[in-house]
Structure formats: structure tokens, C-alpha cells
Amino acid sequence: GSERTCCPVNWVEHERSCYWFSRSGKAWADADNYCRLEDAHLVVVTSWEEQKFVQHHIGPVNTWMGLHDQNGPWKWVDGTDYETGFKNWRPEQPDDWYGHGLGGGEDCAHFTDDGRWNDDVCQRPYRWVCETELDKASQEPPLL
């Protein structure tokens, strides 16, 4: 595989990662697929410093991140441990609210207008952030 040493065009470099900020909305799963096609993943927030960086770039807009509990426990899309990791939920969140009338609860996490996190219906068309790490060899499979 080839090692990525600088960020692609239209991506923002920060602390050895590259970030891409959407300007339109998609459902969480579609945003997840989008990032995967960019050889990236929905943003995984591992520190207060990274939280502030992302918050600065997205502004006061609901924005998906790479955190969900669609299969039970909360999980980060890159495997980062949720229980021991950084969290920035709004008070009384996540609440898996069923009162929205859209069916089911709330299984996907997003940045709210003040940057703190909320769980919401995964089908909502929010903006999103993709992240990929520099110096990580791309997982190019061998041709059979």
C-alpha cells in the first residue's frame, strides 16, 4: 500500500489527521459510506482539543460524527474504545428518545449547535465530517 503524507485537496490538516467538512446533508449511513469511499471514516473525537478544532470548522450546525449504537453499545467507527474515551454529551444525553414519531429510538451521534453531542434518528440528513490519518498505509488489497 502507499502511505499518505499530505492531505488531499479540499481537506484540512490538523494534528496528523485530515478532515473534510461537508456542506450538504446525508443520513448517517450515507455519510458513513461517503467517508469510506474517500478512504476515510466519520470523524472520531478523541480529545477536547480535537473537539474544539471540529467545532470551530462546523459552526452551530448539526453534524454527524462516527459514533453510533445501532447494534447495542455505543461504538466508534474506527474501533476506538468508547467507554474509556473522550465524551462530550449534552446534559441527559444520550437518551434514545422514542418521542419523535419516526419509529425506533436514536442511534447516531451528532454535534449540536453548541458543539456538545446528542443522539438522534440516523435517517436525519445532517452534515458530516470525514477524517483520515496521515502516515497510515492505505489498505490496498492485492489483485488475485
Epitope: 446525508k26 440528513p125 492505505s138 488489497p141
Partner: antibody, heavy 118, light 107 residues
Framework: EVQLLESGGGLVQPGGSLRLSCAAS????????MSWVRQAPGKGLEWVSV????????FYADSVKGRFTISRDNSKNTLYLQMNSLRAEDTAVYYC???????????WGQGTMVTVSS | DIQMTQSPSSVSASVGDRVTITCRAS??????LAWYQQKPGKAPKLLIS???NLQSGVPSRFRGSGSGTDFTLTITSLQPEDFATYCC?????????FGPGTKVDIK
């Protein structure tokens, strides 16, 4: 000049296999996701498959899942579509296309015709 | 899967005419819509991205508009080279899906 050139089409019997190739030039191939899109005679366009720039992520239309495999060799600037268990309904012109940040396709090859018939 | 429909399926027009083609998605797709032009025996050509963004080199007589489920491609003054088939594509969700096309031919 940005260019895509498909090859490998032809006549194949039902149940047979074929491998299509798409040679890319004029852009940094490994930086872009690439797709295959097909068009049956007299019909509209149908998206078939897409792969990320590294080849590490792939998606398929339900109509070809389990039968077709998309892959790429970035050292050769080439995209592939391995087609197995071919059916009459796979008869079409197959185009390779370069994906944009808007999830659409800005560069297309000239197409290669695949005919599945006994 | 998101279904895309177009109307009309064909339109006869003259040089200089204003032509309007509509595309409808079976569910909301925000502005994730592209328009293509295709001539017989040729590959499609991307005209418009993100519902209204004109591709570089595409004449300004082509205009895209709409959001959600209803979209429009307008050719403000039809030129001889514009006689072709036009189709839309939703870029919101996999699998990406195309409209059936609208053929613009000479009246």
C-alpha cells in the same frame, strides 16, 4: 488530457466469465473512487459498482452482488470488473467513470460492449 | 432504493426554444442530484452537479434547480448541438440511481 479507456468486452455464453479493464490517464488515479456503470441496449443507465481510491472499500448493485468484483491496480492506473455467472440481462455497454466529491461522475470512458448470449 | 422518474420522456423542440425537463426522486435527496447529456453511441457527459452547479466548460444556457424531491433542468435557448438525451442521477444514497432519460429531438 484526462482519459478513461475500457477494454475486454465481447460475446460470452450465459454462465460464462469476462474481465473488463479501464486504463486511466491524465489524473492521479489513486486519489479517486471509480465506478462501473452500464447501459443495456435502448435502456437507461444503471450503476453497477464503486471502489475507493485504495480499493479498500467497494459497493455493488444488488443485481450483480456476488457475481461481479470490482478491483484496481493503482501501479498500473487500471480499474477492473470481473464478471462471473453472466446472464442475458447483463448484456450492455459497460462504462468506467471517475467519481467526484458530489458522488456523481465527471469523466467517462467510451464504453465496451458485453453481449451474453448462447 | 431511491427511484428516479423524469418527464417528459421525449420533447420535440426547435432551435432557440426554451426546454424544461423535470426529475423527481422517490424520497428527499437534498441537493444530491446530477444531470447528464448523452448522444447516440457516446458516453454520458456531466452537465450539472449538486442540483445547480454548472460543470466547467458547459454553456450557461443549461440551468439546474430544485431541492428535496423535485428538480428541473432548463435549456434557455436550444442550440443544434443540444439535441440529445438528458438524464438525472441521485447521489444521495447507494445504490446510485439514474432517471430513465428525456430525449430532446428536432420538431
Amino acid at each position: 488530457e484526462v482519459q478513461l479507456l475500457e477494454s475486454g468486452g465481447g460475446l460470452v455464453q450465459p454462465g460464462g466469465s469476462l474481465r473488463l479493464s479501464c486504463a486511466a490517464s491524465g489524473f492521479i488515479f489513486s486519489s479517486y473512487a471509480m465506478s462501473w456503470v452500464r447501459q443495456a441496449p435502448g435502456k437507461g443507465l444503471e450503476w453497477v459498482s464503486v471502489t475507493s481510491g485504495s480499493g479498500g472499500t467497494t459497493f455493488y448493485a444488488d443485481s450483480v452482488k456476488g457475481r461481479f468484483t470490482i478491483s484496481r491496480d493503482n501501479s498500473k492506473n487500471t480499474l477492473y470488473l470481473q464478471m462471473n455467472s453472466l446472464r442475458a440481462e447483463d448484456t450492455a455497454v459497460y462504462y468506467c467513470a471517475k467519481r467526484t466529491q458530489f458522488d456523481d461522475f465527471d469523466i467517462w470512458g467510451q464504453g465496451t460492449m458485453v453481449t451474453v448470449s448462447s | 432504493d431511491i427511484q428516479m422518474t423524469q418527464s417528459p420522456s421525449s420533447v420535440s423542440a426547435s432551435v432557440g426554444d426554451r426546454v424544461t425537463i423535470t426529475c423527481r426522486a422517490s424520497q428527499g435527496i437534498s441537493n444530491w442530484l446530477a444531470w447528464y447529456q448523452q448522444k447516440p453511441g457516446k458516453a454520458p457527459k456531466l452537465l450539472i452537479s449538486a442540483a445547480s452547479n454548472l460543470q466547467s466548460g458547459v454553456p450557461s444556457r443549461f440551468r439546474g434547480s430544485g431541492s428535496g424531491t423535485d428538480f428541473t433542468l432548463t435549456i434557455t435557448s436550444l442550440q443544434p448541438e443540444d439535441f440529445a438525451t438528458y438524464c438525472c442521477q441521485q447521489a444521495n444514497s447507494l445504490p446510485f440511481t439514474f432517471g430513465p432519460g428525456t430525449k430532446v429531438d428536432i420538431k
